[in-house]
Interface confidence: low
Amino acid sequence: AGVFELQIHSFGPGPGPGAPRSPCSARLPCRLFFRVCLKPGLSEEAAESPCALGAALSARGPVYTEQPGAPAPDLPLPDGLLQVPFRDAWPGTFSFIIETWREELGDQIGGPAWSLLARVAGRRRLAAGGPWARDIQRAGAWELRFSYRARCEPPAVGTACTRLCRPRSAPSRCGPGLRPCAPLEDECEAPLVCRAGCSPEHGFCEQPGECRCLEGWTGPLCTVPVSTSSCLSPRGPSSATTGCLVPGPGPCDGNPCANGGSCSETPRSFECTCPRGFYGLRCEVSGVTCADGPCFNGGLCVGGADPDSAYICHCPPGFQGSNCEKRVDRCSLQPCRNGGLCLDLGHALRCRCRAGFAGPRCEHDLDDCAGRACANGGTCVEGGGAHRCSCALGFGGRDCRERADPCAARPCAHGGRCYAHFSGLVCACAPGYMGARCEFPVHPDGASALPAAPPGLRPGDPQRYL
């Protein structure tokens, strides 16, 4: 267990031309706050995917009012660190998203009270217990300077916070085979309490006798790499011989979500939907009030004046979840009919209809044949939103106005010659072939392959196509 800590040093215009306009104005003051989202591994997942390692919000910064005519300076920042507690081992490699949010203190009819000003993301390697790492990230014309570190919570130590340290039992030295816990020389590494044989690289334990696997490893001793390429079952534990996932207990078995959270399986792990007042990977973090700004995406926080009273996030259209953190994919319900393209504009759904369809959900089939005539005895056929003429023999084109050349498509097989005829076409077959399109070979003994030549026609005679 441990804590990831993020310190924002500055947020302001980046170097170079095109300095951004201040996000706050004289008549619409605003203040900034930050959100950090952590994911294990070097994943390149979408910004909306769960923050599996955890997430945190900063306090609100001081209210800032732009001085008219002045360029945007570095903006006043919230006090303190952003802290993301992690319960399991620190993964060593992680992805981060840091969002800079603007809280507008002015009226915004037709818009939210909060808006995302900048989002930076990156993938880093970081050992727990190490020094602060400094970073600079740019998002458009903005520049964010920050530092971060991961530290273990006692008694955990080590680069993954998986080793345990205990105070020395003897004043002079540690027990047999046990090292001092640098840099805490007055403490000793605790005896290994994991299940015997548990992989020291890929497994860890928090309780005596257990063996819990880091991401990407499975098996009772965490010695089997997860490989789902040839597997049908979506979950483990794995078969030690193939490394293939076979049916077994799922990630939600035993409900890892605390404080009444409900668990749902995801392709790689699980996700907790937390009740109000709790958040974190396993709903383990509590004491959140509206002052902490727990509602994302313009959600309105009510109640929750003190840590003992729950807050409620009222989400704007297009977002859901106890903290408005989930974007509603309203197009997944496929509301547009007849092949229309669904567009989720946030405040509304729009359907872009295919030709021949109309209406808010493309539900109206326009009468394609209305007012349209097919020439030369053709008949109009509606279908797929496009008017189409089924033309009489000898005519073609959109409206059957063109004389068709029945031989244009080379319909006579095996070298047969095509002749246009008043009622269609006639194929004169090459020796050895017969049929309306010269498609049937004639057997050497003179008997034809099925179908038999009609009476009165010798093999090789032109076959008239009726």
């Epitope: 619409l28 203190l105 002015g106 009819i109």
Partner: antibody
């Protein structure tokens, strides 16, 4: 000094339409939303709707949809409210109010008295 | 729609007295409540926004408090110029709604 100057009193016949104006000065017009409020019989206030001059966003009270139309002219920093199909129920004082903080009306016009009578 | 209920409808006070006006919302509106003062033949004026924030230039004898559904406007020591109607309004959700008002009269 911020000022919201409304057009003068109106006496109109039932069934007619009227357009009330609210000319602003002393602040950047596009940085504050403009709301309209009806006050009947000198007592309760009724919100008609609001418009954001910056992005054109409009919100109406359901009760006044079809009755009121809100528009702005950014070039003259003026907001307008048109009321149509007037009846005696529409006789009231109408105020425009700008909101600096979120939907709190920090400045109000002096009010326009509308009388609908045959 | 959210209904804002003010009480009492009217009250008569003497100069120097402490006055408490009440406003109740039919559902939780957080702290999105404002108070307006309207003197006879004048337009309303903003006194309090965000339930408890005193607007610029408003005397400190006016205090707003409350959250969720119960809100109060307190005048610690009533002055003659405070004779007016007082309206509360919510801006938690559209449509914005106001209470029916409380008329403050002087004895």
């Amino acid at each position: 000094e911020v000022q919201l100057q409304q057009s003068g009193p109106e006496l109109v016949k039932p069934g007619a339409s009227v357009k009330i104006s609210c000319k602003t000065s002393g602040y950047t017009f596009t940085e504050s939303a403009m709301h309209w409020v009806k006050q009947s019989h000198g007592k309760s206030l009724e919100w008609i709707g609001g418009i954001n001059p910056n992005n054109g966003g409009i919100s109406y009270s359901q009760k006044f949809k079809g009755k009121a139309t809100l528009t702005v002219d950014k070039s003259s920093s003026t907001a307008y409210m048109e009321l149509r199909s007037l009846t005696s129920e529409d006789s009231a004082v109408y105020y425009c109010g700008s909101s600096y903080y979120r939907d709190y009306f920090d400045y109000w016009g002096q009010g326009t008295t509308l009388t609908v009578s045959s | 729609n959210i209904v804002m209920t003010q009480s009492p409808e009217s009250m008569s006070m003497s100069v120097g007295e402490r006055v408490t006006l009440s406003c109740k919302a039919s559902e939780n509106v957080g702290t999105y409540v404002s108070w307006y003062q309207q003197k006879p033949d004048q337009s309303p004026k903003l006194l309090i926004y965000g339930a408890s924030n005193r607007y610029t230039g408003v005397p400190d004898r006016f205090t707003g408090s409350g959250s969720a559904t119960h809100f109060t406007l307190t005048i610690s020591s009533v002055q003659a110029e405070d004779l007016a109607d007082y309206h509360c309004g919510q801006s938690y959700s559209y449509p914005l709604t106001f209470g029916a008002g409380t008329k403050l009269e002087l004895k």
